[in-house]
């Protein structure tokens, strides 16, 4: 049935981009719970994939960040790029691979007392991320910003979260991106467990709200680690520092 293909209580998935940008391997993803492969979704063709476009880091996988692919490139074109490894140059935390953060322009290993061991699960999902682009370009304005005299409400089409009213983020829904509510404590959230997996989503959830991060629900015991339920949970006291 359709519900077994697109379960509304989890991110609904599409095949990954073929031959896309860094972080998006051209081959089909290997079998994993909740992920469909080329030919696995009857509502989409797979003959015209492109590098995954983005407006902010939350739209990219845990191993990626959002930026213009070329330093002198078109400011209006941003895609998800592979994260930067330890000792590589950076401008913000999201550019660094999980387990690292940006310090003095260099990706360095996260100190366990500074960031929790679960940083790889939360680095792109804390509220208040720095959404600046790699080179500080201003983003292209289109009809969406011209048409809005006020910030977008729930269900409004958006290009980025700044188009949306407070408490909302810009996330994919079907073939558009719309303003959806930022997640509250206890609500189910989505983990990007596999590189590039964000590109599979056609029904994105927002990130967790301020002071919350997306973690495995403590009392949710299942046989498979990858199918554990994640919910928005309060940070512990030593986890108040925002990563971005």
């Amino acid at each position: 049935t359709l519900n077994s293909v697109l379960n509304s209580n989890a991110i609904k998935n599409l095949p990954p981009p073929l031959g896309g940008a860094a972080g998006h391997p051209g081959s089909a993803v290997s079998a994993a719970p909740g992920i469909l492969y080329p030919g696995g979704n009857k509502y989409q063709t797979i003959d015209n994939y492109q590098p995954y476009p983005c407006a902010e880091d939350e739209e990219c996988g845990t191993d990626e960040y959002c930026a213009s692919p070329t330093r002198g490139g078109d400011a209006g074109v941003q895609i998800c790029l592979a994260c930067r490894k330890r000792r590589k140059r950076c401008m913000r935390h999201a550019m660094c691979c999980p387990g690292n953060y940006c310090k003095n322009g260099i990706c360095v290993s996260s100190d366990q007392n500074h960031f929790r061991g679960e940083i790889e699960e939360t680095i792109t999902e804390s509220f208040g991320n720095d959404h600046s682009t790699l080179d500080g370009y201003s983003r292209r304005t289109t009809l969406s910003s011209k048409m809005y005299h006020t910030k977008g409400q729930e269900g409004s089409v958006c290009l980025r979260s700044s188009d949306c009213a407070s408490g909302l983020c810009c996330a994919r829904h079907f073939w558009s991106k719309i303003c959806k509510p930022v997640l509250k404590e206890g609500q189910v959230c989505t983990k990007h467990r596999r590189k590039g997996s964000h590109g599979l989503e056609i029904f994105q959830r927002c990130y967790c709200g301020e002071g919350l991060s997306c973690r495995i629900q403590k009392d949710h015991h299942q046989a498979s680690n990858s199918s554990r339920l994640h919910t928005c949970q309060r940070h512990h006291h030593h986890h108040h520092h925002h990563h971005h």
């Epitope: 359709l2 289109t142 269900g155 089409v157 996330a171 073939w175």
Partner: antibody, heavy 117, light 111 residues
Framework: EVQLVESGGGLVQPGGSLRLSCAAS????????ISWVRQAPGKGLEWVAS???????YYPDSVKGRFTISRDNAKNSLYLQMNSLRAEDTAVYYC???????????WGQGTTVTVSS | EIVLTQSPATLSLSPGERATLSCRAS??????????MNWYQQKPGQAPRLLIY???KQGSGIPARFSGSGSGTDFTLTISSLEPEDFAVYYC?????????FGGGTKVEIK
């Protein structure tokens, strides 16, 4: 002013092909999703195909493999290539877009496709 | 796919009267804190026009006499006081899941 103008409809025999066009104006075409929705005579509405602003395409089972949606952002145009047409494809075909919200908030006036021998 | 059932099929009313149209979904169309239910009006020979989206939000330029309510599986479109131009067919449509589906329509005719 947002405008969507369909063309290309007509009479075609079963098994034949037809290409519909939708000319868009009044908005930044390349940034937005756009779809085809059809309505058989005296019947309700049925979603036919959609293409996102980033170029992915989507179809229901009823047309998958027979219809192809495409867009030419340079020409602000949307297309629907219809092959292996059947009598049940007879309908008014509308292009519709989602500019302000996720629903189909702007529609063209429609173009009529008749599949008959 | 989600099936939408509209009732009644035909509603015979006079100008000035209140119209209440119903749409029932085969499963909940709520997700992400939003009810993904929309309502359209269609007059003979014309394209549909969006009236309501997200169950209760008005489309652009829609008169205040049109309002939507409901959540989950049961939704209502209300026209507080029918104007002559309101006699038309009304469709509900869900955007929670692919494929997006439409109800069979309710025809509001002059009594």
């Amino acid at each position: 002013e947002v405008q969507l103008v369909e063309s290309g409809g007509g009479l075609v025999q079963p098994g034949g092909s037809l290409r519909l066009s939708c000319a868009a104006s009044g908005f930044t075409f390349s940034s937005y999703a756009i779809s085809w929705v059809r309505q058989a005579p005296g019947k309700g509405l049925e979603w036919v195909a959609s293409v996102s602003g980033w170029g992915d395409t989507y179809y229901p089972d009823s047309v998958k493999g027979r219809f192809t949606i495409s867009r030419d952002n340079a020409k602000n145009s949307l297309y629907l290539q219809m092959n292996s047409l059947r009598a049940e494809d007879t309908a008014v075909y509308y292009c519709a877009t989602s500019l302000k919200n996720y629903a189909f908030d702007y529609w063209g006036q429609g173009t009529t496709v008749t599949v008959s021998s | 796919e989600i099936v939408l059932t509209q009732s009644p099929a035909t509603l015979s009313l006079s100008p000035g009267e209140r119209a209440t149209l119903s749409c029932r979904a085969s499963e909940s169309v709520d997700d992400f804190g939003i009810s993904f239910m929309n309502w359209y009006q269609q007059k003979p020979g014309q394209a549909p026009r969006l009236l309501i989206y997200a169950a209760s939000k008005q489309g652009s330029g829609i008169p205040a006499r049109f309002s939507g309510s409901g959540s989950g599986t049961d939704f209502t479109l209300t026209i507080s006081s029918l104007e002559p131009e309101d006699f038309a067919v009304y469709y509900c449509q869900q955007s929670k899941e692919v494929p997006p589906t439409f109800g069979g329509g309710t025809k509001v005719e002059i009594k």
